[in-house]
């Protein structure tokens, strides 16, 4: 390896090795290595090995150290948003109103206009404005899967609050799926968390865009703050890595 | 600031400013700044400002950029494990066996022996060995809260599998709570995820340590692999930041 | 990414992760760590050419910018990006201990 | 932590985050970014003394090790640790765009 002057690779390795000596001792807060004079002879006890192995092995559901940011993430993302289809749309009629759930549908043609290809999408968030909430509520988000089935996505424990607050759910994978499929309308369901033995499954939280009986200006403001998808995507022209320095739309 | 030679702070700032020029343009993949000749006069459109603001503001449930590792995390953690109280213990008699749940109890005196003070605990994982699973199963973990109430902790979607696999749940906060309280025995419940409108709530997954009728050696092996808490904690003596360079027990 | 997959199989002269296996006994003269016997520590090495100034040809450097100075530093430096922990077994007196050391293994590097 | 809380209120000579506000118009001569008008970019600066060698007094350096060379580099370097993104509004022709630029604001530094 050469920069201005040649790098002595062996010297760098020796310095790294010496640095590791200090690193390990300092991490263990030892001023010197412990003496081995009284270490019992023979192999390590089974229990110790088992403990070492369970520490060493990654297991399902354990988060690995964060992956390095993919190169694509270095580049800027264009941000767009797609509002939920308004609640007077006939799509909502198919889903009986219930005390435990609310439904949110999106027009995939609007999504495709914002993000022409699934691979360009780097993040999609479902954003909901929750109004004030008197009691703690555990909610779950589902994705409409097939005819009348729903796939669980995530959950959130909502603390009581006197003021409205935006909630955000990462739905990148779901929106990427939708962009790949041919459907016209796709949706989410927000439900109360239902425990197997609990009977009180009412969705207490009030989400902006669902309360009825609003008129005129108030309804418009209310509608603007209805649930939406916030999309971050690499613009198509940037993704094409064109050598031209043009600013394409 | 001085190292061997004086650092010219103004020069560093100028270089950083120039680097930012390149950084912004390269992130936008622009070879030069876009012309402003066709920009409409007047303020930015409301919709654009709203979009900019929702991108700028952090919202509830959105993960912030990762916090830098606390200093305490730099130092090594001692790893111990505490096995679940065996299922023939009378504590289990109080909880009626159900098709949707299994219960796991732990002796807090064993936990305290491993981690004398709550503040020393840096991570606690509940580890379960799941045996082969024929169908996808969505499970939830609860913490025993008060007399007969349970607090939801987390959930996991288990994919079908032909081979046994360790599952891990982060229960650091819960174990820290237990260490602060006076209870003798504390526990978890693993349940099938029960949807508000679903009727089939059976826990299909088979967790090692709960299947009955095992004898002799097999039961021992089975028992060794029963659920346990894997604890990572700062050893008491290391936490005391003694200036002494001693290697204490 | 300047990770082990790319760097170990290339002759990259600029910033990259370099192979380094530490044998506790041979390299550090230590026999007190009972498990593992050693580990792939690796290290970051290589220049991060400073590639931006007012008189630079804009378009020529854009493609290189991400790799050489993504953080827009005044003097970019080749440093670890992804790190992994290392569990060890050692004895204090007669008592075995299992400890996990954070950020011990360099998996990838970056110019920062 | 070598973050803005600590570094902006101290006279730390070693590695620390330093204040730097970028005004797009004044500093870069740009008027094409409509929002924000500028941002606190900050930067990392200061030495990371190399504090380990075979002849070093072990006990004296242990307390310093975490801050100066936690990653056990052969030549530790003062680099960003926590970074934040920056959203901007600009026009391409007549069309306004909102874009988020990752890792633009330095919140803390580390020796790496």
């Amino acid at each position: 390896l050469s920069t201005c002057k040649t790098i002595d690779m062996e010297l760098v390795k020796r310095k790294r090795i010496e640095a590791i000596r200090g690193q390990i001792l300092s991490k263990l807060r030892l001023a010197s290595p412990p003496s081995q004079g009284e270490v019992p002879p023979g192999p390590l006890p089974e229990a110790v090995l088992a403990l070492y192995n369970s520490t060493r092995d990654r297991v399902a559901g354990e988060s690995a150290e964060p992956e390095p940011e993919p190169e694509a993430d270095y580049y800027a993302k264009e941000v767009t948003r797609v509002l939920m289809v308004e609640t007077h749309n006939e799509i909502y009629d198919k889903f009986k109103q219930s005390t435990h759930s609310i439904y949110m549908f999106f027009n995939t043609s609007e999504l495709r206009e914002a993000v022409p290809e699934p691979v360009l999408l780097s993040r999609a968030e479902l954003r909901l404005l929750r109004l004030k909430l008197k009691v703690e509520q555990h909610v779950e988000l589902y994705q409409k899967y097939s005819n009348n089935s729903w796939r669980y996505l995530s959950n959130r424990l909502l603390a009581p609050s006197d003021s409205p607050e935006w909630l955000s759910f990462d739905v990148t994978g779901v929106v990427r799926q939708w962009l790949s499929r041919g459907g016209e309308i796709e949706g989410f369901r927000l439900s109360a968390h239902c425990s197997c033995d609990s009977r009180d499954n009412t969705l207490q939280v009030d989400i902006n865009g669902f309360t009825t009986g609003r008129r005129g200006d108030l309804a418009t403001i209310h509608g603007m703050n209805r649930p939406f998808l916030l999309l971050m995507a690499t613009p198509l022209e940037r993704a094409q890595h064109l050598q031209s320095s043009r600013h394409r739309r | 600031l001085s190292t061997c030679k004086t650092i010219d702070m103004e020069l560093v700032k100028r270089k950083r400013i120039e680097a930012i020029r390149g950084q912004i343009l390269s992130k936008l993949r622009l070879a030069s700044p876009p012309s402003q000749g066709e920009v409409p006069p007047g303020p930015l459109p409301e919709a654009v400002l709203a979009l900019y603001n929702s991108t700028r503001d952090r919202v509830a449930g959105e993960s912030a950029e990762p916090e830098p590792e606390p200093e305490a995390d730099y130092y090594a953690k001692e790893v111990t494990r505490v096995l679940m109280v065996e299922t023939h213990n009378e504590i289990y008699d109080k909880f009626k066996q159900s098709t949707h749940s299994i219960y796991m109890f732990f002796n807090t005196s064993e936990l305290r022996e491993a981690v004398p003070e709550p503040v020393l605990l840096s991570r606690a994982e509940l580890r379960l060995l799941r045996l082969k699973l024929k169908v996808e199963q969505h499970v939830e973990l609860y913490q025993k809260y008060s007399n007969n109430s349970w607090r939801y902790l987390s959930n996991r979607l288990l994919a079908p599998s032909d081979s046994p696999e360790w599952l891990s749940f982060d229960v650091t906060g819960v174990v820290r709570q237990w260490l602060s309280r006076g209870g003798e025995i504390e526990g978890f419940r693993l349940s099938a995820h029960c949807s508000c409108d679903s009727r089939d709530n059976t826990l299909q997954v088979d967790i090692n340590g709960f299947t009955t009728g095992r004898r002799g050696d097999l039961a021992t092996i089975h028992g060794m692999n029963r659920p346990f808490l894997l604890l990572m904690a700062t050893p008491l003596e290391r936490a005391q930041h003694l200036q002494s360079s001693r290697h204490r027990r | 990414a300047l990770d082990t997959n790319y760097c170990f199989s290339s002759t990259e002269k600029n910033c990259c992760v370099r192979q380094l296996y530490i044998d506790f006994r041979k390299d550090l003269g230590w026999k007190w760590i009972h498990e593992p016997k050693g580990y792939h520590a690796n290290f970051c090495l290589g220049p991060c050419p400073y590639i931006w100034s007012l008189d630079t040809q804009y378009s020529k450097v854009l493609a290189l910018y991400n790799q050489h100075n993504p953080g827009a530093s005044a003097a970019p430096c080749c440093v670890p990006q992804a790190l992994e922990p290392l569990p060890i077994v050692y004895y204090v007196g007669r008592k075995p201990k299992v400890e996990q050391l954070s950020n011990m293994i360099v998996r990838s590097c970056k110019c920062s | 932590a070598l973050d803005t809380n600590y570094c902006f209120s101290s006279t730390e000579k070693n590695c620390c985050v330093r204040q730097l506000y970028i005004d797009f118009r004044k500093d870069l001569g740009w008027k094409w970014i409509h929002e924000p008008k500028g941002y606190h970019a900050n930067f990392c600066l200061g030495p990371c003394p190399y504090i380990w060698s075979l002849d070093t007094q072990y006990s004296k350096v242990l307390a310093l090790y975490n801050q100066h060379n936690p990653g056990a580099s052969a030549a530790p370097c003062c680099v960003p640790q926590a970074l934040e993104p920056l959203p901007i509004v600009y026009y391409v022709g007549r069309k306004p765009k909102v874009e988020q630029l990752s890792n633009m604001i330095v919140r803390s530094c580390k020796c790496s």
Partner: antibody, heavy 118, light 107 residues
Framework: EVQLVQSGAEVKKPGASVKVSCKAS????????MHWVRQAPGQGLEWMGR????????KYAQKFQGRATLTVDTSTSTAYMELSRLRSDDTAVYYC???????????WGQGTLVTVSS | DIQMTQSPSSLSASVGDRVTITCRAS??????LNWYQQKPGKAVKLLIY???VLETGVPSRFSGSGSGTDYTLTISSLQPEDFATYFC?????????FGQGTKLEIK
């Protein structure tokens, strides 16, 4: 301040036994092993054995196996070394020393002179 | 058992002199080598452990070096209070063994 204070000098006849005490203060007695070392007149230091005050576990140098007995009283933070069947070549200064797991004796008692003479 | 051979057995020097004492082990002791100072009627005092680590409170004129089987204690500039007997000890393997000692006297 960490201190080890030993009992006073003893004169014993051959064949007799001697019991030397070592009282610890300034640290948690059960956190460190206590070792015993002796030094015959004009000679070097010789390790005799150790006791773990927490468990009472002992380890002796082969030479002293069966003749030396190490005990502790944790209620008073005191360690004892008893040497039986004394011979004239057991005349020495006997030291208790606190052991650090780094492999060294970091605190020593002032020593107890035991003289074996007929 | 590991044999420790210390040399010289005695040494005369003056205040301000630089003095070196060596210790050789019969096998590799992996740097687990400690140095002690003994004065008549006083408790033995730890000076250096693990070859080169200075015990808290010990003046910096004392230093240690070495590896494998050969180790050295150096006093860079003798002070009047340094005249005493010095012992080395290995902490690598049981039984712990000591050198025979070096008596440092005023010339």
């Amino acid at each position: 301040e960490v201190q080890l204070v030993q009992s006073g000098a003893e004169v014993k006849k051959p064949g007799a036994s001697v019991k030397v005490s070592c009282k610890a203060s300034g640290y948690t007695f059960t956190s460190y092993d206590m070792h015993w070392v002796r030094q015959a007149p004009g000679q070097g230091l010789e390790w005799m054995g150790r006791i773990d005050p927490q468990s009472g576990g002992v380890k002796y140098a082969q030479k002293f196996q069966g003749r030396a007995t190490l005990t502790v009283d944790t209620s008073t933070s005191t360690a004892y070394m008893e040497l039986s069947r004394l011979r004239s070549d057991d005349t020495a200064v006997y030291y208790c020393a606190r052991w650090d797991y780094g492999g060294y004796f970091d605190v020593w008692g002032q020593g107890t002179l035991v003289t074996v003479s007929s | 058992d590991i044999q420790m051979t210390q040399s010289p057995s005695s040494l005369s020097a003056s205040v301000g002199d630089r003095v070196t004492i060596t210790c050789r082990a019969s096998q590799d002791i992996y740097n687990y080598l400690n140095w002690y100072q003994q004065k008549p009627g006083k408790a033995v005092k730890l000076l250096i452990y693990y070859t080169s680590v200075l015990e808290t409170g010990v003046p910096s004129r004392f230093s240690g070096s070495g590896s494998g089987t050969d180790y050295t204690l150096t006093i860079s500039s003798l002070q009047p209070e340094d005249f005493a007997t010095y012992f080395c000890q290995q902490g690598d393997e049981l039984p712990w063994t000591f050198g025979q000692g070096t008596k440092l006297e005023i010339k």
